[in-house]
């Protein structure tokens, strides 16, 4: 793993509100050179958020993750906390980003060993959570609305940085062996697909309970199925922003070297997700223009439907 200079490549000016530790898989500090200290939290869906290390919930979360890491290591796995340099596992693909966050990938950073190829499900369902698509908008027209944002501050404040791209399309989790993370949880996503015993035509996936404590974060081997983007419905609740890539092949070859700088534009901060079933299939987007948060949603089969008052809105129609 390349540990380059300590130049600050993530700037956090807005910190996230509480996230349950149950849904966190990894944390690390930003670089000392960033000035303002922050903890970068990674969620189970590989979204990154800035958090204030002085907040009690952040301290508790880090302590919990440390214990989990220790337990996993005892079980023969590895789990990285990685204090210091902040790097995506693969690429800072056009995932969500807050207007208060600036991510500057190093031009000489390692390139991803994986190229994202989301399915049509991903395209239609979730600009909100697809690693390859901006988080600023999300599909609508279904019956399941986003949950109410936290009331005390008018909803969670956004700090999402970027997501880690999907790895493969099927998963079978064996019940006998511990689900080991990769050699480095914060390195290239050279994760091997879990051995599948399912006929792909059945569209089935299997999960068995392994032995390690709480299935301690098996994040080195997160496997995405069928171009999944599991939670589009809340992707807007933290004022996430769609990045504006500095090059034109917006979905191709998202290696760190391909993005000289990332800036953001604000978009609507609430939305309702697509709840319509979508046919699975292969879809490899090759956009010819940069992806802006204000892009025409029809191009990707979504409809932007802001919910001005999520507290009052019912979650189902």
């Amino acid at each position: 793993q390349h540990h380059g200079v300590t130049k600050c490549n993530i700037t956090c000016s807005k910190m996230t509100s509480k996230i349950p530790v149950a849904l966190l898989i990894h944390y690390q500090q930003n670089q000392a050179s960033c000035g303002k200290r922050a903890i970068i939290l990674e969620t189970r869906q590989h979204r990154l958020f800035c958090a204030d290390p002085k907040e009690q919930w952040v301290k508790d979360a880090m302590q919990h993750l440390d214990r989990q890491a220790a337990a996993l290591t005892r079980n023969g796995g590895t789990f990285e906390k990685q204090i210091g340099e902040v790097k995506p596992r693969t690429t800072p693909a056009a995932g969500g980003m807050d207007e208060s966050v600036v991510l500057e990938p190093e031009a000489t950073g390692e390139s991803s060993s994986l190229e994202p190829t989301p399915s049509s499900q991903e395209a239609q369902r979730a600009l909100g959570t697809s690693p390859e698509l901006p988080t600023g908008v999300t599909g609508s027209s279904g019956t399941r609305l986003p949950p109410t944002p936290k009331a005390q501050d008018g909803g969670p404040v956004g700090t999402e940085l970027f997501r880690v791209p999907p790895v493969s399309t099927a998963a079978t989790w064996q019940s006998s062996a511990p689900h080991q993370p990769g050699p480095s949880l914060w390195a290239e996503a050279k994760t091997s697909e879990a051995p599948s015993t399912q006929d792909p035509s059945t569209q089935a996936s299997t999960a068995s309970s392994p032995a390690p404590e709480e299935n301690a974060p098996s994040e080195g081997q997160r496997v995405w199925g069928q171009g999944q983007s599991p939670r589009p419905e809340n992707s807007l609740e933290r004022e996430e922003m769609g990045p504006v890539p500095a090059h034109t092949d917006a979905f191709q070859d998202w290696g760190p070297g391909s993005m000289a700088h990332v800036s953001v534009v604000p978009v609507s901060s609430e939305g309702t997700p697509s709840r319509e079933p979508v046919a699975s299939g292969s879809w490899t987007p090759k956009a010819e223009e940069p992806i802006h948060a204000t892009m025409d949603p029809q191009r990707l089969g979504v409809l932007i439907t802001p919910v001005p008052d999520a507290q009052a809105a019912t979650r189902r129609q």
Partner: antibody, heavy 122, light 107 residues
């Protein structure tokens, strides 16, 4: 309307395996985590594990480790929970439930199946 | 694991009464708490979640309070349909755990 419909009651012998189904409708099946919750007679609720159909590795309650398998058939929007090496204390009602929240909010369970009663008896 | 201790385990009250059920966590759960109502032979029903947010369709007579490790569910004026068993659930950390339940009976 979101609905989770579970399979019917089961009677099994100790040592056997049971497979309970949970058919989802009214939402995009692959977008939401499915959880399984056990409720033994006269007892409280116990979370067994989560899984998102066809995707991330599951997470299980340590108490059920090695005995639970969760599968999902996306063509029929059905999740399955298989419990092996059954013993009498597995006699319970088993619920599937979904958590509607993004990972920034957490897993509370807003939709539940009607429950499947499992009786383990020799 | 975080243990959830609910009290009382049973409670008798009359229609119109104000009742309070408490839930204590063995560690900080940072307000990631949900309350459920369960009637015999039925699945639990979500009442409140994170930061005491009322779930969809739940009457406003139900409210929650608390922080840190101590939380309370209050029913301001009991209605006949409120007689049921109530459970709290923490979802700060896995394994998610529920309280032992409070059975609310008609006096």
């Amino acid at each position: 309307e979101v609905q989770l419909v579970q399979s019917g009651a089961e009677v099994k012998k100790p040592g056997a395996t049971v497979k309970i189904s949970c058919k989802a409708s009214g939402y995009t099946f692959t977008n939401y985590y499915i959880h399984w919750v056990q409720q033994a007679p006269g007892k409280g609720l116990e979370w067994m594990g989560w899984f998102i159909p066809g995707s991330d590795p599951p997470k299980f309650n340590e108490r059920f480790k090695g005995r639970v398998t969760i599968t999902a058939d996306k063509s029929t929007n059905t999740a399955y929970m298989e419990l092996s090496s059954l013993r009498s204390e597995d006699t319970a009602v088993y619920y599937c439930a979904t958590s509607p929240t993004d990972e920034t909010q957490g897993d509370y369970f807003d939709y539940w199946g009607q429950g499947t009663t499992l009786t383990v008896s020799s | 694991d975080i243990q959830m201790t609910q009290s009382p385990s049973s409670l008798s009250a009359s229609v119109g009464d104000r009742v309070t059920i408490t839930c204590r966590a063995s560690g900080r759960i940072h307000d990631f708490l949900a309350w459920y109502q369960q009637k015999p032979g039925k699945a639990p029903k979500l009442l409140l979640y994170t930061d005491n947010t009322l779930a969809e369709g739940v009457p406003s007579r139900f409210s929650g309070s608390g922080s840190g490790t101590d939380y309370t569910l209050t029913i301001s004026s009991l209605q006949p349909e409120d007689f049921a068993t109530y459970y709290c659930q923490q979802f700060w950390s896995t394994p998610y755990t529920f309280g032992g339940g409070t059975k609310l009976e008609i006096k």
